[in-house]
């Protein structure tokens, strides 16, 4: 499937659209700090050098690889060393090293302010008056916020922006019919981008098997009915596709995308009985609703997993002949079974079964030692189930904002040294899984909270492994990914921890925070608890609830006060004198 | 002007049980914290329970299990139920109000104070 001229290719089997939009996705996902205008210019002049090459392949430099093109393309930024710094070191580099250099680059966790939304009409204006450059400064500023979102997703997202703007703009009530549609494409948006991000951290820390198996395990529960060979080339795809967008190569991603959901749509009745209405979209639609499909049912009178993996006398030949392929078929079995598990729960299970083959396989009587491995099973399914009836109970009793803080604190304890940005956006996203998946019924808890906590959790890897500060992140991050949650769970209190010294200055507040939104005030209060707790890590929940509490009291009562400033200055010291006699600082 | 009037003590017997209450007024009632403290003769005053303007209760160890503090908003009134008294809970308690748990809990720069009320417990 060899081509003369890659961009021509791709410009081809893309549309000019697509190519722009996702050029210049890749372009602000590798240099993160550039003007839009500089990047925009930048994916002009690729995108006229692609119409040359499909006017004729065999025009100069259409045979360079798409990671030619663009590397020697972005190393003409002027300002590469100044902005960047060590990254203009990668210029200097060939390929693909080079792009290995940029790939190592990106940062999760960008120097780059606050996205604030501009009043409704100042949007519909922005938007009337050049729709194209308002939708590709979206793509460009989720992009460079977001360097491994998902490309092809993302330019569906912009469909999205786009029609909501389209609708809106003309509506009665800008407002009433914008904002919500945004809120709800900012909150899938930062799921999206997490989720990928885990994939992501997959592929390139744990490698393709990894990758591989989390995929057959998921497609397995999604499409029980299809056959194994099915699900393998499917899982075999995907990885390509997700190999290719984690690496950087969006346009064969996008491309490769789009095959994958052609091949399941005209396969459908050997994969599943769910995706009928997904294949009846448009390209992005498609592939977002197959990505989304809920589990098609399992097939009627499915036999007893102990016949083909423990009862027949076959098992070690027939795991020595194929090691990966009969693990793969295990893992297939079972998870097409067990919709109600979560992925991580599955690979655990997979991960226990190839060990005890490993040493069964070697041993005198391999029957009688791995006659008894389902048992194995019992207290690697029962203990997630155990802790997401705890954690619901607690949310239940708690609600939302108060469920986070008891993680807050939870997770302050285990590892204070992490950065207290950084514990406030893990704790509170960790909390989410409450609203998530408490209301869901049993059979449906386990999947939606252990793999949500997994994405979560990989949000705490990624940001950590940019500036490490814990032996105890790192650990439980680094040593196997399908064990993040249960090693984070067993961390107990940090005892080698040294409390931060008191600094009246973390919590001196001002009027500022009574025009902040329910939710950034909850931040900053949230912000405060985390300090509390790196001042006295044993503090007890009733100290640090009456402290809360009378946080909450201060801002409500400075808030109502005629001279809020005067209110927070000497109603602040008094709460600040207060709490450090409670705690005993 | 703010006034706090403790009513309720009196003597009892070991083993049995008072009920005080604490009239507030010339304040915003619900948005303080309200607490229960007493003193000993010859000692320190020290604090018994504290409830939150959001109705979160706190209490001392002594306390715990034994006393109840509790608040009715619409009477302005704060309470607290004493059962199993023992003789060295033999004090003049105070009722005291403030916008801070912490500040009840630690006695720092409390707002308003009651007169108090006598609880003698023989045994």
């Known amino acids: 499937d060899a081509h003369k001229s890659e961009v021509a290719h791709r410009f081809k089997d893309l549309g000019e659209e697509n190519f722009k939009a996702l050029v210049l996705i890749a372009f602000a996902q590798y240099l993160q700090q550039c003007p839009f205008e500089d990047h925009v210019k930048l994916v002009n002049e690729v995108t006229e050098f692609a119409k040359t090459c499909v006017a004729d392949e065999s025009a100069e430099n259409c045979d360079k690889s798409l990671h030619t093109l663009f590397g020697d393309k972005l190393c003409t930024v002027a300002t590469l060393r100044e902005t960047y710094g060590e990254m203009a070191d990668c210029c200097a580099k060939q390929e693909p090293e080079r792009n290995e250099c940029f790939l190592q680059h990106k940062d999760d966790n960008p120097n780059l302010p606050r996205l604030v939304r501009p009043e409704v009409d100042v949007m519909c204006t922005a938007f009337h008056d050049n729709e194209e450059t308002f939708l590709k400064k979206y793509l460009y500023e989720i992009a460079r916020r977001h360097p491994y979102f998902y490309a092809p997703e993302l330019l569906f997202f912009a469909k999205r922006y786009k029609a909501a703007f389209t609708e809106c703009c003309q509506a009665a009530d800008k407002a009433a019919c914008l904002l919500p549609k945004l809120d709800e494409l900012r909150d899938e948006g930062k799921a999206s981008s997490a989720k990928q991000r885990l994939k992501c951290a997959s592929l390139q820390k744990f490698g393709e098997r990894a990758f591989k198996a989390w995929a057959v395990a998921r497609l397995s529960q999604r499409f029980p009915k299809a056959e194994f060979a099915e699900v393998s080339k499917l899982v075999t795809d995907l990885t390509k596709v997700h190999t290719e967008c984690c690496h950087g190569d969006l346009l064969e991603c996008a491309d490769d995308r789009a095959d994958l959901a052609k091949y399941i749509c005209e396969n459908q009745d050997s994969i599943s009985s769910k995706l009928k209405e997904c294949c009846e979209k448009p390209l992005l639609e498609k592939s977002h609703c197959i990505a989304e499909v809920e589990n098609d049912e399992m097939p009627a009178d499915l036999p007893s997993l102990a016949a083909d993996f423990v009862e027949s006398k076959d098992v070690c030949k027939n795991y020595a002949e194929a090691k990966d392929v009969f693990l793969g078929m295990f893992l297939y079995e079972y998870a097409r079974r067990h919709p109600d598990y979560s992925v991580v729960l599955l690979l655990r299970l997979a991960k226990t079964y190839e060990t005890t083959l490993e040493k069964c396989c070697a041993a005198a009587d391999p029957h009688e030692c791995y006659a008894k491995v389902f048992d194995e099973f019992k207290p690697l399914v029962e203990e997630p189930q155990n802790l997401i009836k705890q954690n619901c109970e607690l949310f239940e009793q708690l609600g939302e904002y108060k469920f986070q803080n008891a993680l807050l604190v939870r997770y302050t304890k285990k590892v204070p040294q992490v950065s207290t940005p950084t514990l406030v956006e893990v704790s509170r996203n960790l909390g989410k899984v409450g609203s998530k998946c408490c209301k869901h019924p049993e059979a449906k808890r386990m999947p939606c909270a252990e793999d949500y906590l997994s994405v979560v959790l990989n949000q705490l890897c990624v940001l950590h492994e940019k500036t490490p500060v814990s032996d105890r992140v790192t650990k439980c991050c680094t040593e196997s990914l399908v064990n993040r949650r249960p090693c984070f769970s067993a961390l107990e209190v940090d005892e080698t921890y040294v409390p931060k010294e008191f600094n009246a200055e973390t919590f001196t507040f001002h009027a500022d925070i009574c025009t902040l939104s329910e939710k950034e005030r909850q931040i900053k209060k949230q912000t405060a608890l985390v300090e509390l707790v790196k001042h006295k890590p044993k503090a007890t929940k009733e100290q640090l609830k009456a402290v809360m509490d009378d946080f909450a009291a201060f801002v409500e009562k400075c808030c109502k006060a005629d001279d809020k400033e005067t209110c927070f200055a000497e109603e602040g010291k008094k709460l600040v004198a207060a709490s450090q006699a409670a705690l005993g600082l | 002007e703010v006034q706090l009037v403790e009513s309720g003590g009196g003597l009892v017997q070991a083993g049995g049980s008072l009920r005080l209450s604490c009239a507030a007024s010339?304040?915003?009632?619900?948005?303080?914290?309200m607490g229960w403290f007493r003193q000993a003769p010859g000692k320190q005053r020290e604090y018994v329970a504290v409830i939150s303007s959001s109705d979160t209760t706190y209490y001392t160890n002594s306390a715990k299990g034994r006393f109840t503090i509790s608040r009715d908003n619409a009477e302005n009134t704060v309470y607290l139920q004493m059962n199993s008294l023992k003789p060295e809970d033999t004090a003049v308690y105070f009722c005291a109000a403030d916008s801070f748990v912490t500040a009840l809990q630690t006695l720092t720069q409390i707002n308003y104070w009651g007169q108090g009320t006598q609880v003698t417990v023989s045994s």
């Open positions: 010339g304040l915003s009632f619900s948005r303080y914290a």
